[in-house]
């Protein structure tokens, strides 16, 4: 297993609809044809897997059907979007990139993106 640098933004604020997007960029040392991207969430020293996808260069990322993540790839950049977020989902979201093929296997883990989620205020009652 060889190490690889992964860069991602330090902070992202989710939209009022609970959607957060960020770019995960990796420094590929070779010409990988199969890349696996995993998003991990770290909160209160607990790390959980949010979503994962393997893509072949030139194709879109394919997440599980019930995944809260979507994404696109362009070269060594992955544009990730996480939806359905609520205030309780605020935390550090870490991008993990694995170059699966061809050998050798490379692994890179970003420093994480702190995603802040603020639940929208309920609309006040209307007299109309």
């Amino acid at each position: 297993c060889k190490a690889m640098h992964v860069a991602q933004p330090a902070v992202v604020l989710a939209s009022s609809r609970g959607i957060a997007s960020f770019v995960c960029e990796y420094a590929s040392p070779g010409k990988a044809t199969e890349v696996r991207v995993t998003v991990l969430r770290q909160a209160d020293s607990q790390v959980t897997e949010v979503c994962a996808a393997t893509y072949m260069m030139g194709n879109e990322l394919t997440f599980l059907d019930d995944s809260i993540c979507t994404g696109t790839s362009s070269g060594n950049q992955v544009n990730l979007t996480i939806q359905g977020l609520r205030a309780m989902d605020t935390g550090l979201y870490i991008c993990k990139v694995e170059l699966m093929y061809p050998p050798p296997y490379y692994l890179g883990i970003g420093n994480g993106t702190q995603i802040y989620v603020i639940d929208p205020e309920p609309c006040p009652d209307s007299d109309f």
Epitope: A53, T54, M56, T62
Partner: nanobody, 117 residues
Framework: AVQLVDSGGGLVQAGGSLRLSCAAS????????MAWYRQGPGKERELVAS???????AYTDSVKGRFTISRDNAKNTVYLQMNSLKPEDTAVYYC???WGFGDYGSWGQGTQVTVSS
């Protein structure tokens, strides 16, 4: 893991066509992606074409407009239609199935394609 069986290779003259098939032992509908790689004499294995679960396709530049990848989920089979073949397409062609959720996927055994000039 799903087992893959490649077939359809053979000897063909330049300009001819071949259709490769990759039959899977189980359902391919949930696979992240399926692809064809090839390895020419003295060369590294290279990605030729891929197709995702959603049907998105991608091709290496040298085969664009000549090769077409497709999948038939009902038959659990992936195809590579190769037209206008060139001598430089000579290689062993391997089918590849990719999961991506804690699995490295599967390879077919390979099928030889030889294009004579």
């Amino acid at each position: 893991a799903v087992q893959l069986v490649d077939s359809g290779g053979g000897l063909v003259q330049a300009g001819g066509s071949l259709r490769l098939s990759c039959a899977a032992s189980g359902s391919i509908s949930s696979l992240n992606a399926m692809a064809w790689y090839r390895q020419g004499p003295g060369k590294e294995r290279e990605l030729v074409a891929s197709i995702t679960r959603g049907g998105s396709t991608a091709y290496t530049d040298s085969v664009k407009g000549r090769f077409t990848i497709s999948r038939d989920n009902a038959k659990n089979t992936v195809y590579l239609q190769m037209n206008s073949l060139k001598p430089e397409d000579t290689a062993v062609y391997y089918c590849r199935a990719v999961w991506g959720f804690g699995d490295y996927g599967s390879w077919g055994q390979g099928t030889q394609v030889t294009v004579s000039s």
